[in-house]
């Protein structure tokens, strides 16, 4: 677990749980609504998603030099998902199915949080996104879009965790 | 089987308060927003609002800001509404309604009288 | 606001009868138009959303149709059991509004 003191995380079982992520970002896409995405929608929500960077220390040598930029910077992208997620754009009509894959990808996205930042530790979480109300006709595109993003952020994410599970576990 | 359990009805002094309860069961609570509406006796159907069990956000008609105070409890799945500065056109019956307005509760009904 | 127009307020029917219902958006809320039934002293029942998508438990002879601005409930053969009023809702942008109501009567 990365703890303040910056030893590393459980690399496995976040590789695991960010493959899972995986798995859950793509099932859910198509699921997000009721009909075709004909009106155009608001970007506001969906402009300022975080993105992993070159500067914030992912690739293998940052890693190996000190892994806590990146997962901190993981962690700000998880939890700003995980906000997006329980949100109306998600939690408001139309109404997803109760067995929706979004209701897992939520939860996932809260347990690999938790899994980088135990109880008594914060990281600064700097993008927290807007919580205003979404109108309506405006979620199911930005369902998509969030969703969409998503898939690219885990992605990373998990190639960050297979790297980190093969060559920097104990 | 969702269902959703409304507390019982009110009748309520002219500037007083009231809060009422609508319980939910049957779903995973926080994955919806609870809607709110009211209904004046032999009249139409008004949306007050809802709130977002997840995080507490609620989002109002503006006709009803100032009136009515939507909150949620997850501990107990349960959403509750509260009216203040209650007048006469404030006696209704008040409906939760969750899930794209397919599961509704039995209503409440507050009455305002002197 | 949306505002929501039905017609007529009341309608008078014989059982077997197919009757429409009418509602009116004064803008267009593409597709996201519910229909409910409330029966006198009940809690209103969702019959369709978002247009014409049917609801489980709900008879097969109602049905919905429209897009844009104007919208029908339809019910192919009436029962008795049918009386009460029909409300449609916006459910486009908020806040959500509601038409006055058609009452259903039985002759």
């Known amino acids: 677990r990365a703890v303040p003191g910056g030893s590393s995380p459980a690399w496995t079982q976040c590789q695991q749980l960010s493959q899972k992520l995986c798995t859950l970002a793509w099932s859910a896409h198509p699921l997000v609504g009721h009909m075709d995405l004909r009106e155009e929608g608001d970007e506001e929500t969906t402009n300022d998603v975080p993105h992993i960077q070159c500067g914030d220390g992912c690739d293998p040598q940052g890693l190996r030099d000190n892994s806590q930029f990146c997962l901190q910077r993981i962690h700000q992208g998880l939890i700003f998902y995980e906000k997006l997620l329980g949100s109306d754009i998600f939690t408001g009509e139309p109404s997803l199915l109760p067995d929706s894959p979004v209701g897992q990808l939520h939860a996932s996205l809260l347990g690999l949080s938790q899994l980088l930042q135990p109880e008594g530790h914060h990281w600064e979480t700097q993008q927290i996104p807007s919580l205003s109300p979404s109108q309506p006709w405006q979620r199911l595109l930005l369902r998509f879009k969030i969703l969409r993003s998503l898939q690219a952020f885990v992605a990373v994410a998990a190639r960050v965790f297979a790297h980190g599970a093969a060559t920097l576990s104990p | 089987e969702v269902q959703l359990q409304q507390s019982g009805p009110e009748l309520v002094k002219p500037g007083a308060s009231v809060k009422m309860s609508c319980k939910a069961s049957?779903?995973?609570?926080?994955?919806?927003?609870m809607h709110w509406v009211k209904q004046k006796p032999g009249q139409g159907l008004e949306w007050i609002g809802y709130i977002n069990p997840y995080n507490d956000v609620p989002n109002y008609n503006e006709n009803f800001k100032g009136k009515a105070t939507l909150t949620s409890d997850k501990s107990s799945s349960t959403a509750s509404m509260e009216l203040s500065s209650l007048t006469s056109e404030d006696s209704a019956v008040y409906y939760c309604?969750?899930?794209?307005?397919?599961?509704w509760g039995q209503g409440t009904l507050v009455t305002v009288s002197a | 606001d949306i505002v929501m127009t039905q017609s007529p307020a009341t309608l008078s029917v014989t059982p077997g009868d197919r009757v429409s219902l009418s509602c009116r958006a004064s803008?267009?809320?593409?597709?996201?138009l519910y229909w409910y039934q409330q029966k006198s002293h009940e809690s209103p029942r969702l019959l369709i959303k978002?247009?014409?998508q049917s609801i489980s438990g709900i008879p097969s002879r109602f049905s919905g149709s429209g897009s844009g601005s104007d919208f029908t409930l339809s019910i192919n053969s009436v029962e008795p059991e049918d009386v009460g009023v029909y409300y449609c809702q916006n459910g486009h942008s908020f806040p959500y509004t509601f038409g006055g109501g058609t009452k259903l009567e039985i002759k």
């Open positions: 049957g779903y995973t609570f926080t994955r919806y927003v």
């Open positions: 978002y247009a014409s």
């Open positions: 803008q267009r809320i593409s597709d996201y």
């Open positions: 309604a969750v899930w794209d307005f397919t599961y």
